[in-house]
């Protein structure tokens, strides 16, 4: 799915009002020094691509994030604010239903959610590299690419 045409400000609002708090709840009890963020993103569509992948794609050692509260809210936000997104997610929904049986918080899942928090931070922040990538802070003209 190409996230270029999403309403980024609305997704950001959904994240800050609820999803971020669910991620913090999931991570509660974890030392803030425990994980090093290794996944990064360069602009908002790229961040959403990485967020979708980490949230919904089962990985070795962490197969069950898709049924967590933050994941369901993320899915709802993308479905509402990214045109055509929900049509692309029928297969993913089936995979989610299969994963529902086991809900185990492993260290690998905690690491993955820490990575997610980092990706969301980059989604929310202005781009640091001034190289003509998508301007994060772009609400009136959000799909034009330009320098800060």
């Amino acid at each position: 799915y190409d996230f270029t045409n999403c309403d980024f400000e609305k997704i950001k609002a959904a994240y800050l009002s609820t999803i971020s708090k669910d991620l913090i709840t999931y991570m509660s009890g974890t030392k803030s020094t425990e994980f090093n963020n290794t996944v990064s993103c360069s602009n908002r569509p790229h961040c959403l691509t990485e967020i979708q992948s980490l949230t919904f794609n089962p990985t070795a050692g962490c197969a069950s994030l898709a049924k967590e509260m933050f994941a369901m809210k993320t899915k709802a936000a993308l479905a509402i604010w990214c045109p055509g997104y929900s049509e692309t997610q029928i297969n993913a929904t089936q995979a989610m239903k299969k994963a529902r049986k086991s809900k185990v918080t492993t260290n690998k899942c905690l690491e993955q959610v820490s990575q997610l928090q980092g990706l969301w931070r980059r989604f929310n922040r202005p781009l640091l590299k001034q190289q003509g990538s998508s301007d994060y802070k772009d609400d009136d003209d959000k799909h034009h690419h330009h320098h800060h």
Partner: antibody
Framework: EVQLVQSGAEVKKPGSSVKVSCKAS????????IEWVRQAPGQGLEWIGV????????NYNENFKGRATLTADKSTSTAYIELSSLRSEDTAVYYC????????????WGQGTTVTVSS | DIVMTQSPDSLAVSLGERATINCKAS??????VTWYQQKPGQSPKLLIY???QHYTGVPDRFSGSGSGTDFTLTISSLQAEDVAVYYC?????????FGQGTKLEIK
């Protein structure tokens, strides 16, 4: 507990340079941006710039471009600001601050470093 | 650069009364506004982010509202410990900019 501890006060001559350090602890240093803000005596807050300690990316306020240099040393979890060609107007308290968990605010601040520029 | 203008510059309110501080942006900053409190001789402290979201541990008497260009920080019932300078900040475009500050005192 997250902490940002800054280096001590400095007195400098006009035209010289100063380097202020900000040592982070209590979290993974490379995961969060570090911001630099200054406050002249009796004045408000002025944003200088930001660095991503994870990859060294920076963004500067144009007012400081060419004079301010932000760096970070992951091995010691320390961020630095160097300000060159100092003038009396640079007399201020310099703060480092960490971005919060959502990336939309500065949640932890250093105690501040007073830099006095005087001949 | 986006200019953030606070009003009033200073404000005296009686204990237990409501205090309201306004912040106007020179152009739309969406909802990317943060409020900080700074007491004399201390570093700033985060109060409210993204217009209205409370930072951890901030008392409920502090609230934020607004969108676009006009924003407000409200203290519903002023306490003695709320005496400080309050700053708004836009997080929408580089360079990040602060308001000039509003000094809040007890009447």
């Amino acid at each position: 507990e997250v902490q940002l501890v800054q280096s001590g006060a400095e007195v400098k001559k006009p035209g010289s340079s100063v380097k202020v350090s900000c040592k982070a602890s209590g979290y993974t240093f490379s995961n969060y941006l570090i911001e630099w803000v200054r406050q002249a005596p009796g004045q408000g807050l002025e944003w200088i710039g930001v660095i991503d300690p994870g990859n060294g990316d920076t963004n500067y306020n144009e007012n400081f471009k060419g004079r301010a240099t932000l760096t970070a040393d992951k091995s010691t979890s320390t961020a630095y600001i160097e300000l060159s060609s100092l003038r009396s107007e640079d007399t201020a308290v310099y703060y480092c601050a960490r971005e919060d968990n959502t990336g939309t605010a500065f949640d932890y601040w250093g105690q501040g470093t007073t830099v006095t520029v005087s001949s | 650069d986006i200019v953030m203008t606070q009003s009033p510059d200073s404000l005296a309110v009686s204990l237990g009364e409501r205090a309201t501080i306004n912040c106007k942006a020179s152009q739309s900053v969406s909802s990317d506004v943060t409020w900080y409190q700074q007491k004399p001789g201390q570093s700033p402290k985060l109060l409210i982010y993204y217009v209205s979201q409370h930072y951890t541990g901030v008392p409920d008497r502090f609230s934020g509202s607004g969108s676009g260009t006009d924003f407000t920080l409200t203290i519903s019932s002023l306490q003695a410990e709320d005496v400080a300078v309050y700053y708004c900040q836009q997080h929408h475009r580089f360079p990040l900019t602060f308001g000039q500050g509003t000094k809040l005192e007890i009447k």
